[in-house]
């Protein structure tokens, strides 16, 4: 697993470095998760040919993965800090069930998959501290999540490989968009 966020080797060399601000900590946390996703994607792509599949074929998959849209207020045009923050937190909470699904999908990167899951929980906590309107954040229903997880795990091998690839790609895209948006806050 990569070095946990906090202090990387460059930071260690600077003993008088200021403690990380809330924004820097969030930024570092997202980049740590993205590094983990890159490692998981590597294993997935080496194992199957899903990474060569066209986006159109992937789009046919009926997974309801969180996605940013103009109305969410996270893009430069129509940027709205509070609406966007709510979208990011809600999206991450919705991704949690998919990250749980990933837990038994990796052989050599099992630790990495766990690190991505746990780091996402920490990221959600960081972001919740930043949000003013916590009431607007809808938490996914645990019963719905449990049945979704069962359904995903019951798929055939090809569909499971496809689902794994799609989750990783979508989560990466969601985090990259979040990274861009959070920098405007």
């Amino acid at each position: 697993a990569p070095v946990p966020p906090g202090e990387d080797s460059k930071d260690v060399a600077a003993p008088h470095r200021q403690p990380l601000t809330s924004s820097e900590r969030i930024d570092k946390q997202i980049r740590y998760i993205l590094d983990g996703i890159s490692a998981l994607r590597k294993e997935t792509c080496n194992k199957s040919n899903m990474c060569e599949s066209s986006k159109e074929a992937l789009a046919e998959n009926n997974l309801n993965l969180p996605k940013m849209a103009e109305k969410d207020g996270c893009f430069q045009s129509g940027f709205n800090e509070e609406t966007c923050l709510v979208k990011i937190i809600t999206g991450l909470l919705e991704f949690e069930v998919y990250l749980e699904y990933l837990q038994n999908r990796f052989e050599s990167s099992e630790e990495q998959a766990r690190a991505v899951q746990m780091s996402t929980k920490v990221l959600i906590q960081f972001l919740q501290k930043k949000a003013k309107n916590l009431d607007a954040i809808t938490t996914p229903d645990p019963t719905t999540n449990a049945s979704l997880l069962t359904k995903l795990q019951a798929q055939n091998q090809w569909l499971q490989d496809m689902t794994t690839h799609l989750i990783l790609r979508s989560f990466k895209e969601f985090l990259q968009s979040s990274l861009r948006a959070l920098r405007q806050m």
Epitope: R31, R180, R183
Partner: antibody, heavy 120, light 106 residues
Framework: EVQLVESGGGLVQPGGSLRLSCAAS????????MIWVRQAPGKGLEWVSD????????YYADSVKGRFTMSRDISKNTVYLQMNSLRAEDTAVYYC?????????????WGRGTLVTVSS | DIQMTQSPSTLSASVGDRVTITCRAS??????LAWYQQKPGKAPKVLIY???TLESGVPSRFSGSGSGTEFTLTISSLQPDDFATYYC????????FGQGTKLEIK
Amino acid sequence: EVQLVESGGGLVQPGGSLRLSCAASGFTISSNYMIWVRQAPGKGLEWVSDLYYYAGDTYYADSVKGRFTMSRDISKNTVYLQMNSLRAEDTAVYYCARWADDHPPWIDLWGRGTLVTVSS
Amino acid sequence: DIQMTQSPSTLSASVGDRVTITCRASQGISSWLAWYQQKPGKAPKVLIYKASTLESGVPSRFSGSGSGTEFTLTISSLQPDDFATYYCQQSWLGGSFGQGTKLEIK
């Protein structure tokens, strides 16, 4: 071969419009993060705008915000820069480029550029 | 927009010299910085990305360092092919460039 080819440059009067095209080959723009950079004659490089493939999210430099629009046509594997209300200071070679898919990104592929001249 | 300030704007040096170019960001950008080399009439080419990672195929005499707001590009021993203009670029938000450093023969 992986490359970017810009077209659409030329002479235009102040206040006029122009649309630049950037045709990508050897990779798909639908899963890449694209950028326009310009360079006025004898001057330095200036970032103009970028388009993140995810949901087509665009960012613009303050100097062009509200006048320029970056878009894409996935079926043609082409990126566009629609330039309106052009000014003399928009005269430059416009480069289409690709951000590397990494965090942090850097420009790992450049086109050869197309010259836009704004003059009466 | 994030402002990138590069210095010096012109640098006169001789083959074999060690030269350093500095780039300062108007706000913290972590290691989200790249260095490019441009020759007249050509598109730029990347030398260093992530502040200190050398691009494949770029000679090891080029090195980058820094994090936060202060960055440097160093050429340990100038070669005739290195006389060109150098730019830093941040990718933290948008992609603004420094104004460039023209490296010329003394």
